[in-house]
């Protein structure tokens, strides 16, 4: 970068090289060029010469002033005009950054995805800081009082093998950058309470042509957790509102769920599960599309991701079982 150039002088920033966005800043340039008493001193920002707000302080020093500086990053350098030299002589350069101190991390969440071997901790970092911000995740055993710290730039995966201090822990997150430091509230966890079952997947659908046509959705999970509660949501692709069906599930065999749907309509299905009575849900599964036939039976197997599924329409749908209307997005 610009900071690696050979300097014939010195460039510095007040109040600092990294400063709060929107501040007034001064950039100083001091020449120390052999056989040259600078006639003029020039400043460049990102390669473009600045023409105004430059103050010559003395024979060798000038200052460039910026009001309300809002750029996250800029490369600054300054040059001198030496008598009888028509090319400007480079004095020095510096990369400057502006941003914000971190917000207090909130919504700290730690989960163990079944079979992952890791505890994954995430949090809401708050507003964008624009500058390098590091997070230290503190994990303290409530049984042994031993504390471990993990440095990261975003979320963290902690091997469950390293959690040797029993089952109960306090977790909190410290955010720090050049402009400040903040600490989250402490989250108390029990390792047995934060397991999310192995992903539930819809494998296929079929519509059986009976007196009243019936659609069967086949779905499964590799979980070994015995007591699992699941939700399946579905809607016509032209609608916005989801219908939700709830299940207490035993995954020793493939699940079959029955729906009584309108003929000749394209539907979308998703499923998610949690260990019964626990706090965290799986994310919703990939979108599974199924078009009901007009009369003839039809079997499909379409499970794929689609980015435009929630396109903002409403539904009226007929089904058996316990139904609720749902406008929720993906909740953890």
């Amino acid at each position: 970068g610009i900071t690696n150039i050979n300097c014939s002088g010195h460039i510095w920033v007040e109040p600092a090289t990294i400063f709060k966005m929107g501040m007034n800043i001064s950039i100083y340039c001091q020449a120390a060029i052999k056989n040259c008493q600078p006639r003029k001193l020039h400043f460049y920002k990102n390669g473009i010469k600045e023409r105004f707000q430059i103050t010559r302080i003395n024979k060798t020093t000038a200052r460039l002033w910026y009001k309300n500086f809002l750029e996250p990053h800029a490369s600054m350098y300054c040059t001198a005009e030496c008598p009888k030299h028509f090319q400007e002589t480079l004095i020095c350069g510096k990369d400057i950054s502006s941003g914000y101190p971190p917000d207090i991390p909130d919504e700290v969440t730690c989960v163990i995805y079944e079979y992952s071997g890791n505890m994954t901790c995430t949090w809401n970092a708050g507003k964008l800081t624009y500058i390098d911000t590091k997070y230290v995740v503190h994990v303290k055993s409530l049984e042994t009082e031993e504390e471990q710290q993990y440095l990261t730039s975003s979320y963290i995966n902690i091997s469950t093998d390293s959690l040797q201090g029993g089952k109960k822990y306090l977790v909190w997150v410290q955010a720090a950058n050049a402009l400040g430091m903040e600490e989250s509230k402490q989250l108390q966890i029990h390792l047995d309470d934060i397991v999310i079952p192995s992903a539930a997947v819809i494998s296929r659908a079929e519509t059986i042509n009976a007196t009243v046509p019936k659609t069967i959705i086949y779905w499964d999970s590799q979980t070994t957790i015995e007591k699992v509660s699941c939700e399946m949501r579905y809607k016509a692709t032209t609608n916005q509102t989801w219908n939700v069906k709830e299940f207490d599930t035993n995954f020793t065999y493939v699940q079959q769920s029955e729906f009584y749907l309108e003929p000749n309509i394209k539907y979308v299905f998703q499923v998610r599960c949690q260990e019964t009575g626990k706090r965290y849900w799986q994310p919703w599964s990939s979108l599974f599309f199924h078009k009901t036939p007009e009369t003839v039976p039809q079997v499909t197997s379409k499970a794929f991701q689609h980015d435009t599924w929630n396109s903002g329409l409403t539904v009226a749908s007929i089904s058996t079982g316990h139904l609720t209307s749902d406008n929720r997005g993906d909740i953890g």
């Epitope: 008493q37 006639r39 003029k40 023409r51 105004f52 707000q53 430059i54 103050t55 010559r56 302080i57 003395n58 024979k59 020093t61 005009e81 008598p83 009888k84 028509f86």
Partner: antibody
């Protein structure tokens, strides 16, 4: 010997244009910034504009930059000031000055007088 | 724009005296200040640059001092030929500006 000789002054009507010239000798013209400074009779000096060695950089008094253009011809050792939409308040003696290596104006011409009147 | 104020429009002194002419800038100009002398019917001449450096050929009875916002031109052992207008100028920030001038009168 450093010598700066201004020319082109005279009486003009408001709204008209005029071009002042300054012929330099006794130094390497292209090595120096040059400037124009004006002085209303019995009043103070007012810096008007300056120009770098090759004419690629110019600066003006804010109130004049829409009407005045400073330029130079290094081959002929001449500095120019093109003035348009002249007003009575532009009436002054116009001095051409060399900006020394230390930035101050170290040599001045004898001045040329411009009178803007109807 | 930076305003340079020379508070005394006129100053009266006698031959052999010492006189100080002041110039105040509306904001910090470091040491980027020059002083000029303009005798009646003549063009200005540079006396001092960088606040305190005498130009070539300027008698050493002329001394400049100051930095930031307050500057002084001191003439010690005033001579009759020093009858003139004296101007300060800042070349710290564009547009360059000039003080209103101080006329030195010899009693």
């Amino acid at each position: 010997e450093v010598k700066l000789v201004e020319s082109g002054g005279g009486l003009v009507q408001p709204g008209s244009s005029m071009k002042l010239s300054c012929t330099a000798s006794g130094f390497t013209f292209s090595d120096y910034y040059m400037a124009w400074v004006r002085q209303v009779p019995e009043k103070g000096l007012e810096w008007v504009a300056n120009i770098n060695y090759d004419g690629s950089n110019t600066y003006y008094l804010d109130s004049l930059k829409s009407r005045f253009i400073i330029s130079r011809d290094n081959a002929k050792n001449i500095l120019y000031l093109q003035m348009s939409s002249l007003k009575s308040e532009d009436t002054a003696t116009y001095y051409c000055a060399r900006e020394g290596y230390d930035e101050a104006m170290d040599y001045w011409g004898q001045g040329t007088t411009l009178t803007v009147s109807s | 724009d930076i305003v340079l104020t020379q508070s005394h429009k006129f100053m009266s002194t006698s031959v052999g005296d010492r006189v100080s002419i002041t110039c105040k800038a509306s904001q910090d100009v470091g040491t980027a200040v020059a002083w000029y002398q303009q005798k009646p019917g003549q063009s200005p001449k540079l006396l001092i640059y960088w606040a305190s450096t005498r130009h070539t050929g300027v008698p050493d009875r002329f001394t400049g001092s100051g930095s930031g916002t307050d500057f002084t031109l001191t003439i010690s052992n005033v001579q009759s030929e020093d009858l003139a207008d004296y101007f300060c100028q800042q070349y710290s920030t564009y547009p360059y500006t000039v003080g209103g001038g101080t006329k030195l009168e010899i009693k």
